[in-house]
């Protein structure tokens, strides 16, 4: 698996989505989970609903909400006030008796200011990027949410690094 | 392991490059953060590095005063501080941090790197 | 900014001595929190994480607690290499900030 990085400013929230095959993975849950070091297991963060049918409910662990489009075959994970111990290594999974499969490996960048990346240009406007090996960068800003505020899509510039 | 450059005297207004080579572990796989400590004070963060990627996140402080990149293929994180002045006189540290993170601080430090700016 | 306020500034103590420092977060920093102990020499060395967790290798007369926004390290028992200067350090938040430290003597 190649990993995509998704970089998000501290105090805002951050949306990471997974896309997978809806046929492959019908009747699966989802889960997120943040691999802790090296080697080891992926620490569950959360999962989607019990009941497959009603996996486009939003569940929050924490500050992290998961929601899942089975039809659109599209997972979302949303870090609400993102802090910079957020940043890591993560994984969206698809969940089958005591296997999990992965669907995207997910790095989160927490930046602390939208302007401190060396190619802080690409966070607002797309544009060609140095050197991230195969790595695929999802620059995601958005504004902070308030309290039981449902998030909103943010704007996304994907670019695919070779 | 993180072995940091020697010590360095250079004149006011003048910039230096100072060097942190990691080695016993996956460079790409940790942050790597900057501290300064001016003699005989506590210590300030000045900034982290993500090696993998090359983002970075600075303290307001040191915006415009330090600049911090890395050579994956050395294993190694620079820190370039330019326009000296006498405040700038410290002794700096690199600390790494954890797992494409920073969410349990800094395990592991160099032995410091000594900067003195003086005419 | 977060301010970590730590006490006290100096502290000479005997061998075998109880000794407890601490720092007050100016905000919530919800347990990222780390001490470190710095040697004469300059050497640091991360002694706890998470407000209470104990780096691997390090004695276990060193011990960490929290009681709200106070966060305390307290050494059971003086040794004659635990003389050296103490930092707390929060990672809650950007920036980072470090406490203004405490220097623990031989009294």
């Known amino acids: 698996h190649n990993t995509t990085v998704f970089q998000g400013v501290a105090g805002q929230s951050l949306q990471v989505s997974c896309p997978y095959d809806s046929m492959k993975h019908w009747g699966r849950r989802k889960a997120w989970c943040r691999q802790l070091g090296e080697k080891g297991p992926c620490q569950r963060v959360v999962s989607t609903h019990n009941l497959w049918l009603l996996s486009f409910l939003r569940r929050w662990n924490g500050s992290t909400a998961i929601t899942d489009d089975t039809l659109g075959g599209t997972l979302t994970i949303t870090l609400r006030n993102l802090q910079p111990h957020d940043a890591g290594l993560y994984q969206c999974q698809s969940l089958h008796g005591s296997e999990a499969d992965t669907l995207r490996k997910v790095l989160v960048e927490v930046l602390a200011d939208p302007l401190d990346h060396r190619d802080a240009g690409d966070l607002w406007f797309p544009g060609e990027s140095e050197s991230f090996e195969d790595a695929h960068v999802e620059h995601s800003i958005s504004r902070s949410l308030l309290e039981g505020e449902i998030p909103f899509p943010p704007t996304s510039h994907h670019h695919h690094h070779h | 392991q993180l072995q940091e450059s020697g010590p360095v005297l250079v004149k006011p207004g003048a910039s230096v490059k100072m060097s942190c080579k990691a080695s016993g572990y996956t460079f790409t796989d940790y942050y790597m953060n900057w501290v300064k400590q001016s003699h005989g004070k506590s210590l300030e963060w000045i900034g982290v590095i993500n090696p993998y990627t090359g983002a970075t996140s600075y303290n307001q402080k040191f915006k415009g005063k330090a600049t911090l990149t890395v050579d994956k293929s050395s294993s190694t994180a620079y820190m370039e501080l330019n326009s000296l002045t006498s405040e700038d006189s410290a002794v700096y540290y690199c600390?790494?941090?954890?797992?494409?993170?920073?969410?349990?601080?800094?395990?592991?430090w160099g032995q410091g790197t000594l900067v003195t700016v003086s005419a | 900014d977060i301010q970590m306020t730590q006490s006290p500034s100096s502290l000479s103590a005997s061998l075998g001595e109880r000794v407890s420092l601490t720092c007050r977060a100016s905000?919530?920093?919800?347990?990222?929190l780390s001490w470190l102990q710095q040697k004469p020499d300059g050497t640091i060395k991360r002694l706890i994480y998470?407000?209470?967790t104990l780096d691997s290798g390090v004695p276990k007369r060193f011990s960490g607690s929290r009681s709200g926004s106070d966060y305390s390290l307290t050494i059971s028992s003086l040794e004659s290499e635990d003389f050296a200067d103490y930092y707390c350090l929060q990672y809650a938040s950007y920036p980072y900030t470090f406490g203004g430290g405490t220097k623990l003597e031989i009294k």
């Open positions: 998470a407000a209470s």
């Open positions: 600390a790494r941090g954890t797992y494409y993170s920073n969410y349990e601080g800094f395990p592991y």
């Open positions: 905000q919530e920093i919800s347990g990222y």
